[in-house]
Amino acid sequence: ESLGTEQRVVGRAAEVPGPEPGQQEQLVFGSGDAVELSCPPPGGGPMGPTVWVKDGTGLVPSERVLVGPQRLQVLNASHEDSGAYSCRQRLTQRVLCHFSVRVTDAPSSGDDEDGEDEAEDTGVDTGAPYWTRPERMDKKLLAVPAANTVRFRCPAAGNPTPSISWLKNGREFRGEHRIGGIKLRHQQWSLVMESVVPSDRGNYTCVVENKFGSIRQTYTLDVLERSPHRPILQAGLPANQTAVLGSDVEFHCKVYSDAQPHIQWLKHVEVNGSKVGPDGTPYVTVLKSWISESVEADVRLRLANVSERDGGEYLCRATNFIGVAEKAFWLSVHGPRAAEEELVEADEAGSVYAG
């Protein structure tokens, strides 16, 4: 057995605080404004001691952050004050009120439009890079809901054909800098990020250059936290793996959820030769299960010394009071069959159920 694998269900559902309110107020403030959040006692009864929390961390009162039992004030707000705020009962940690706050200093715009731009043969003998579709580059601020796909494009030309590279917040931006990776489509002069999350916010700069010169364009991405929402999952790459018998395999899944998610690693199995139960639901075995207390969780599953019976489909599943999200991971095991693996274990480890 290995890191991240358990042979029994260890969920903590019984100890989760009471249900969070279904409504999360979404508020937008301007930079420099005073953010004021009010949380009156439910039913007008006594409030009891409370604590205000931002993005999972208790707020510390200061000259700028004024904390009261029913009210929170953040003076001279800046972009860093954006986030998920909640007022909780101190003893039970039950969420009484729940706000999504965005502090903005620029108007937001909608989703990017589609369309591809191939590299163009301009017929110019030699020349520094230039933008071929500048009218498509006017939208410098992009505000999109979480889980959407974002595409930035910088269609350009020059002779020799220029190269394109991308920066995030002024630094080189590579696929490993975000869990879902990125797609660089050089032919279309584009950067694509799927299933964006709040940590993808920032300034993205394309740098187009050849030996005669360099041009650049910066876009600002704001990821809007839709709330309430079911968990958002990102699969760490590669999601599908081929492993040699006896090797170790690791799957990585990232979970985002403003409400405490119940996170599970599951594996599809057969029961009496069938992959699905009488109602058509797939049979799965629970490998790992727990409640995350953070709005963001990295979850890993490591399979040590894999055998052929470890091959198949694995699921990272996250459930909160709004809904369920799943990501599938595939493992294919191949290689010489070791003698000891001819012995088939009597029963499948874990709890099997139709899930």
Epitope: R12, G56, V197, G236, W290, E293, S294, E296, V299
Partner: antibody, heavy 119, light 108 residues
């Protein structure tokens, strides 16, 4: 090979500041949660701060809240701990650690850097 | 906060002995219990995670058991290099992440 190397420790007067750095290698830094822990001379282990893989979620122990700031720079494969208003009781070896996952152990540790707060 | 209590706080034993260290949590932590070994002047090293899983590269004489609130670290046959301080740590409820106070294992 996974490696975590701390630096920035030293002698500082009460009320002073220090910035600890931890440079990591051998794994994809941007997909792991990280923490700082410390150990006062002859004492046990104390967790002091946590940062999620994206840097969006941060936690502190009550003993350092409001004085210490954790941050990370994935482009530089670096974890930081900014320590202000240092007190004698902050004297300890500070360890940079990798957290296996959200419910997992600290599977790799740096060698530690000594911070001494004394007048 | 979840409190972790280790016992004994120190222990004398001889090479070849079977040694048991216990750790108790102030509330149920399921199987989210990890054990570390620390030698003087060195950083701690992960031995056991998820209560009973042996970390890669750790000798099989080390084993862990328990669930809920009571956990045990066992060294089946003590070797000279095993004399060190051992810590338990819960990763069930965070923050804060809490450790036991440590058990110092000395040569008799």
């Amino acid at each position: 090979e996974v490696q975590l190397v701390e630096s920035g420790g030293g002698l500082v007067q009460p009320g002073g500041s220090l910035r600890l750095s931890c440079i990591v290698s051998g794994f994809i830094f941007s997909s792991y949660e990280m923490s700082w822990l410390r150990q006062a001379p002859g004492k046990g282990l104390e967790w002091i701060s946590y940062i999620s893989s994206s840097g969006r979620v941060i936690y502190y122990a009550d003993s350092v809240k409001g004085r210490f700031t954790i941050s990370r720079d994935s482009a530089k494969n670096s974890l930081y701990l900014e320590m202000n208003s240092l007190r004698a009781e902050d004297t300890a070896i500070y360890y940079c650690t990798r957290k296996w996952d959200s419910s997992g152990p600290f599977d790799f540790w740096g060698q530690g850097t000594l911070v001494t707060v004394s007048s | 906060d979840i409190q972790m209590t280790q016992s004994p706080s120190s222990l004398s034993a001889s090479v070849g002995d079977r040694v048991t260290i216990t750790c108790r949590a102030s509330q149920s932590i399921s199987s989210y219990l990890n054990w570390y070994q620390q030698k003087p002047g060195k950083a701690p090293k992960l031995l056991i995670y998820a209560a009973s899983s042996l970390q890669s590269g750790v000798p099989s004489r080390f084993s862990g058991s328990g669930s809920g609130t009571d956990f045990t670290l066992t060294i089946s046959s003590l070797q000279p290099e095993d004399f060190a301080t051992y810590y338990c740590q819960q990763s069930y409820s965070t923050p804060p992440i809490t450790f036991g106070q440590g058990t110092r294992l000395e040569i008799k």
